[in-house]
């Protein structure tokens, strides 16, 4: 867990922070950066996927988009599902901030969330036959 | 609405209990659109190491193991949130930063036909 937290010399300009916690500015750097979604790779892929949005008002960001593979197998040149190949999810960890209510007090916790980004077509290693 | 600045616990909670983040570690080789992983390291960021995918081929690997240029390998990109030390070098003061990473590659039918 806490890689890179303690080996820095603390400059005089660093803000004072209570023990066991850290100061986090949630004004996002590069907020307006956008992924080009116009290429429709999710529907053109041989392992196509759909998107579902999960929403949680106590999470920042409140919206997290998850990809969902459409098929067990992969789409062949004829547009048919080939079950001898496998569609599999590609996943990436990201950070979110969780707001926790304990009685009248509110605390904040960083969380690692695993997001499914898309799908890829792989040769199987598991053969579901007898 | 979240306040602009919050104090958060130093321990980062892991919600990934159902699945293993390292699970797809061999997909880069088994995919029909294989990729190489490149290490991106930045001590001013948490996590300090992020792996970037680079598609190995323009085309996709066919059933014979050859590159088929009638199909395209393309990167799957995702915006993720990381922590950036702010001010720089401070051990316990961060700002959220959005970065674009290539996570892997997928094989797609082309929309641009690069033919003579």
């Amino acid at each position: 867990g806490s890689e890179g937290e303690t080996f820095f010399q603390k400059p005089e300009s660093c803000p004072p922070v209570p023990g066991g916690s850290m100061k986090l500015d949630i004004g996002i750097i590069n907020e307006n950066q956008r992924v080009s979604m116009s290429r429709n790779i999710e529907s053109r892929s041989t392992s196509p996927w759909d998107y579902t949005v999960t929403w949680d008002p106590n999470r920042y960001p409140s919206e997290v988009v998850q990809a969902q593979c459409r098929n067990l197998g992969c789409i062949n040149a004829q547009g048919k599902e080939d079950i001898s190949m496998n569609s599999v999810p590609i996943q990436q960890e990201t950070l979110v901030v969780r707001r926790k209510h304990q009685g009248s007090s509110v605390s904040f916790q960083l969380e690692k969330v695993l997001v499914t980004v898309g799908c890829t077509c792989v040769t199987p290693v598991i053969h579901h036959v007898q | 609405n979240f306040p602009r600045t919050v104090m958060v616990n130093l321990n980062i909670h892991n919600r990934n209990t159902n699945t293993n983040p390292k699970r797809s570690s061999d997909y880069y080789d088994r995919s029909t659109s294989p990729w190489n992983l490149h290490r991106n390291e930045d001590p001013e960021r948490y996590p300090s190491v992020i792996w970037e995918a680079k598609c190995r081929h323009l085309g996709c690997i066919n059933a014979d193991g050859n590159v088929d240029y009638h199909m395209n390998s393309v990167p799957i990109q995702q915006e993720i949130l990381v922590l950036r030390r702010e001010p720089p070098h401070c051990p316990n003061s961060f700002r959220l930063e959005k970065i674009l990473v290539s996570v892997g590659c997928t094989c797609v039918t082309p929309i641009v036909h690069h033919v003579a």
Epitope: W49, D50, T52, V53, T54, V64, Q66, A67, Q68, C69, R70, N71, L72, G73, E81, I83, N86, S87, V88, P89, Q91, V115, T116, V122, P124, V125, I126, H128 | T17, N18, T19, N20, R23, S24
Partner: nanobody
Framework: QVQLVESGGGLVQAGGSLRLSCAAS????????MGWFRQAPGKEREFVAA????????KYTDSVKDRFTMSRDYAKKQVYLEMNSLKPEDTAVYYC????????????????WGQGTQVTVSS
């Protein structure tokens, strides 16, 4: 946390039919495949069938092909296993589960299991 409730098992004569149901809750937004598995006394749990939530595409183990049919109701988050021409060797406890990596999911990667539903086929 994923919760799985299987039902529909029972005692049936060889050649008979049963329809199993599975209700799944707590699935992640990226869940895309569900499977049926079975475990006979003294044997390891084995894969029976899988279905894609979105496309409805299916995969069966060879011994049940043309006899078993898996279907799903995406809105209700339920899957079903229609079992026809049952044989004594189909006797087992049947389980359903989310397949987080589809057909690539290994048996040791399933975190949660339901209680299962007993299917007994008498000769």
């Amino acid at each position: 946390q994923v919760q799985l409730v299987e039902s529909g098992g029972g005692l049936v004569q060889a050649g008979g039919s049963l329809r199993l149901s599975c209700a799944a809750s707590g699935l992640t937004g990226s869940s895309y495949a569900m499977g049926w598995f079975r475990q006979a006394p003294g044997k390891e749990r084995e894969f029976v069938a899988a279905i894609s939530w979105i496309s409805g595409g299916t995969k069966y183990t060879d011994s049940v092909k043309d006899r078993f049919t898996m279907s799903r109701d995406y809105a209700k988050k339920q899957v079903y296993l229609e079992m026809n021409s049952l044989k004594p060797e189909d006797t087992a406890v049947y389980y359903c589960n989310d397949m987080p990596y589809g057909l690539d999911t290994r048996m040791d990667e399933y975190v949660y299991w339901g209680q299962g539903t007993q299917v007994t086929v008498s000769s």
